[in-house]
């Protein structure tokens, strides 16, 4: 007799996902060796448990300690790169700027960053078929907490200067139901944090505004503000001329505005 | 079986470029960091880079940094590593070369290699 | 970057007598995960390198058990129990702690 199975309006678990995790695991400890004494095995382990043979609505942050503290990792505080809506360029930036991190320079980031998974309540198989949407769906699923933990953590960790890239060809540049607005934003220490400052990304070649005084940049001075950290702002009119400059910062052409 | 195969010998003119290539099969492309390693004749080995394949993400030697370009096709299941304004010292055999995986922990050792691909260069 | 030292450049031997290279690192190889990166490679003329040793001690898969490693710290060494014609070539450590990779200069086993 078939079990009946539940349907979820979201794309199923990324296929190969056990090989995924495990090989993204030891490439990451092969060119980071400040983490290899971290079992692979064990975080797989950690991950699986997380979210295995529970209800993939019912998932809590606690689910996922035990995989928290194996990928326990520190990076320089002062460093961190957060991005919203704007992820492949941020990355292209750490990769040229090697001493600043974004979450997903980061063991846990790494190991999950493009993947989607799910299980089934009092089932150990994992659900290839379907996973929850958050939308439409629910919000406490397996992608979902994962990334908030992680971020949460991530967004914890910061001090000094905390850098934010932000995608200025969207409606709302910072948007505050993104993993950003929601999450790290909330979650930065004032103690700790002196200042936010955003870089707002240009799409357009002929956009010459001044986006840092959107609304939606007004807004997110404001919330920043109250929590008693600095705001500052600066427009990348030019992102490829921007990732030119961080790599040759002295090529002529890179003291003008970008 | 896992095998590492390098596109042909090259002679190149001094300050042009070369471009190898290691085409990888038995195994999945992804799931590997791919390094590049030199040996100039009778001289030792040297390390040059490595690429993710993955995610395309690099890290050069020092040494390398300004001229040598590691990228990869994902479809083909193929690393390439670009050498820019050749040098009389960079005619050299050119490897690729994989670690292996000992019970889910990378051995840190290069244990595949590619059978190498000569670059000469001249004036 | 961490310098690889081998003695002897040269090493002359009798079939069927043991062999021994030396190799020692700037700093030590040893990992807070207990394991210690120094690998030993062979490369016969003409061929690309071959992995015989990893984390100081293990043999690589299919190496003969006549290839053996030890040391500690920064001092180790590659011994063949009783040589044989096929093990005519070079013979490099290289460490892989920290990036960059890197290797000794080799050191060429020939037979007498």
């Known amino acids: 007799v078939p079990r009946w199975r539940q349907q979820w309006s979201g794309p199923g678990t990324t296929k190969r996902f056990p090989e995924t995790v495990l090989a993204r695991c030891v490439k990451y400890t092969e060119i980071h060796p400040e983490m290899r004494h971290v079992d692979c095995q064990s975080v797989w382990d950690a991950f699986k448990g997380a979210f295995i043979s529970k209800h993939p609505c019912n998932i809590t942050e606690e689910d996922y300690q035990p995989l928290m503290k194996l990928g326990t990792q520190t990076v320089p505080c002062n460093k961190i790169l957060l991005w919203s809506r704007i992820k492949d360029l941020a990355h292209q930036f750490t990769q040229v700027q090697r001493d600043m991190f974004t979450l997903e320079d980061t063991l846990l980031g790494y190991l999950a960053d493009d993947l989607t998974w799910c299980g089934e309540f009092n089932t150990s198989k994992i659900n290839y078929q379907s996973c929850p949407d958050w939308r439409k769906d629910c919000s406490n699923n397996p992608v979902s907490v994962f990334w908030k933990t992680v971020s949460r953590r991530f967004a914890e960790a910061a001090c000094d200067v905390v850098h934010v890239m932000l995608n200025g060809s969207r409606s709302k540049i910072f948007d505050k139901n993104s993993t950003f607005g929601s999450v790290e934003v909330h979650n930065l220490q004032p103690e700790k944090v002196q200042t936010l400052e955003a870089w707002v990304i240009h799409g357009g070649r002929e956009d010459s505004r001044d986006l840092c005084q959107d609304p939606t940049i007004k807004e997110l001075e404001s919330i920043i503000s109250k929590r008693n950290i600095q705001f500052s702002c600066k427009n990348i009119y030019r992102p490829d001329k921007f990732l030119q400059c961080v790599k040759n910062p002295e090529d002529s052409s890179c003291t003008s505005e970008i | 079986q896992m095998q590492l195969v390098q596109s042909g010998a090259e002679v190149k003119k001094t300050g042009s470029s070369v471009k190898v290539s290691c085409k990888a099969s038995g195994y999945t492309f992804t799931d590997y960091i791919m390094h590049w390693v030199r040996q100039a004749p009778g001289q030792a080995l040297e390390w040059m880079g490595w690429?993710?394949?993955?995610?395309?993400?690099?890290d050069y030697a020092q040494k390398f940094q300004d001229r040598v370009t590691i990228t990869r096709d994902r479809s083909m299941s193929t690393a390439y590593m670009e050498l820019s304004s050749l040098r009389s010292e960079d005619t050299a055999m050119y490897y690729c070369?994989?670690?292996?995986?000992?019970?889910?922990?990378?051995?840190?050792?290069?244990?595949?290699w590619g059978q190498g691909t000569l670059v000469t260069v001249s004036s | 970057d961490i310098v690889m030292t081998q003695t002897p450049l040269s090493s002359p031997v009798t079939l069927g007598q043991p062999a021994s290279i030396s190799c020692q690192s700037s700093?030590?190889?040893?990992?807070?995960?207990?394991?210690?990166?120094l690998n030993w490679l062979q490369q016969r003329p003409g061929q690309p390198p071959r992995l015989l040793i990893y984390?100081?001690?293990t043999r690589a898969a299919g190496v003969p058990d006549r290839f053996s490693g030890s040391g500690a710290g920064t001092d180790f060494t590659l011994k063949i129990s009783r040589v044989e014609a096929e093990d005519v070539g070079v013979y490099y450590c290289q460490q892989f702690l920290e990036y960059p990779p890197t290797f000794g200069q080799g050191t060429k086993l020939e037979i007498k």
């Open positions: 700093e030590s190889l040893l990992h807070s995960n207990g394991k210690t990166y």
């Open positions: 070369a994989r670690v292996a995986i000992i019970t889910t922990v990378a051995s840190g050792g290069f244990a595949y």
């Open positions: 690429i993710d394949p993955e995610y395309g993400s690099t």
């Open positions: 984390w100081m001690s």
